[in-house]
């Protein structure tokens, strides 16, 4: 059974992930971002279901395409280089989902824009955090 300390750690990691995803979304939605139109043409894949930490596998698998799209944006829109930002997210995701179980992600048929993709994972983080508090 999860201890209060492990629950607290999970909550902090989720909050960190949430902040990183929100920072990316804010950088993209920044009214000064001339790349928004181009960024919105890129397709992202969404999980059929995302209710548990193991479903973060679906986020992990789309981090490289996310980095590619962020490479289009001026680095001043973000505090970190896309490579460093995605690397940080990857570390948190790996810790949260755990490496013991191998989960095969199932994707929805419809693709999403980067904004829809980020909003979906922001909602996921918020939902899990609310169950922990």
């Amino acid at each position: 059974a999860p201890t209060s300390s492990s629950t607290k750690k999970t909550q902090l990691q989720l909050e960190h992930l949430l902040l990183d995803l929100q920072m990316i979304l804010n950088g993209i939605n920044n009214y000064k971002n001339p790349k928004l139109t181009r960024m919105l043409t890129f397709k992202f894949y969404m999980p059929k279901k995302a209710t548990e930490l193991k479903h973060l596998q679906c986020l992990e698998e789309e981090l490289k395409p996310l980095e590619e799209v962020l490479n289009l944006a001026q680095s001043k829109n973000f505090h970190l280089r896309p490579r460093d930002l995605i690397s940080n997210i990857n570390v948190i995701v790996l810790e949260l989902k755990g490496s013991e179980t191998t989960f095969m992600c199932e994707y929805a048929d419809e693709t999403a824009t980067i904004v829809e993709f980020l909003n979906r994972w922001i909602t996921f983080c918020q939902s899990i955090i609310s169950t922990l508090t």
Partner: antibody, heavy 121, light 113 residues
Framework: EIQLQQSGPELRRPGSSVKLSCKAS????????IHWVRHRPEHGLEWIGW????????RYAQKFQSKATLTADTSSNAAYMQLSSLTPEDTATYFC??????????????WGQGTLVTVSS | DIVMTQSPFSLAVSEGEMVTINCKSS????????????LAWYQQKPGQSPKLLIY???TGQSGVPDRFIGSGSGTDFTLTISDVQAEDLADYYC?????????FGAGTKLELK
């Protein structure tokens, strides 16, 4: 028809610079990134970098960071690459290229005919 | 950067033969979301620009003869040319475009025996 028309061959002395052009037709240059690729027969193909003509933003492969400067002029629907501090190693054919569609930056489907740059004293 | 190891370096063939060119990447090029491998194959003839033959590892570019077949997934890829024609004599390159910077294989020269 989508075409990328490049400038003619160039002969340069070591230490000098050269500016190559790539004029796009059949589409609006601001809709796609323009990539530049180097071909040396003994080294194959190497990606140099890209420019987004819409706002002039660029990305370079690390080894070309201080060698190449990419620019674009939307009014003439053209992209340019300046190569500085030329050495005989820069002798190569340089290509500009565009991706297959706008939903992803690669692969390169449309290519210019190439510009041969020869660096010799 | 992803390293693309292409083999063989050169290949001498007779017309009508079948040839295979291999490309191995240092990391997987498969995107799970769409089950596509971000790998392309190019043909380059002397004095010409490279021509896109195959993208997403196995999708033939419009107008490319169907004797050019791309296969493979993950890290191992193959370009097969069945019934080689004289006009197929050229250099062939693989390109990964999964992770920036995009990187090419060293190339394979297809020559006539």
């Amino acid at each position: 028809e989508i075409q990328l028309q490049q400038s003619g061959p160039e002969l340069r002395r070591p230490g000098s610079s050269v500016k190559l052009s790539c004029k796009a037709s059949g589409y609006n240059i601001t809709d796609y990134l323009i990539h530049w690729v180097r071909h040396r027969p003994e080294h194959g193909l190497e990606w140099i970098g890209w420019i987004d003509p819409e706002d002039g933003e660029t990305r370079y492969a690390q080894k070309f960071q201080s060698k190449a400067t990419l620019t674009a002029d939307t009014s003439s629907n053209a992209a340019y690459m300046q190569l500085s501090s030329l050495t005989p190693e820069d002798t190569a054919t340089y290509f500009c290229a565009r991706s297959l569609d706008s939903t992803y930056n690669y692969p390169f489907a449309y290519w210019g005919q190439g510009t041969l740059v020869t660096v010799s004293s | 950067d992803i390293v693309m190891t292409q083999s063989p370096f050169s290949l001498a063939v007779s017309e009508g033969e079948m040839v295979t060119i291999n490309c191995k990447s240092s990391q997987s090029l498969l995107r799970s979301g769409n089950q596509k491998n971000y790998l392309a194959w190019y043909q380059q003839k002397p004095g010409q620009s490279p021509k896109l033959l195959i993208y997403y590892a196995s999708t033939g570019q419009s107008g490319v003869p169907d004797r050019f077949i791309g296969s493979g997934s993950g890290t191992d890829f193959t370009l097969t040319i069945s019934d080689v024609q004289a006009e197929d004599l050229a250099d062939y390159y693989c390109l990964q475009h999964w992770i920036s910077p995009p990187t090419f294989g060293a190339g394979t020269k297809l020559e006539l025996k």
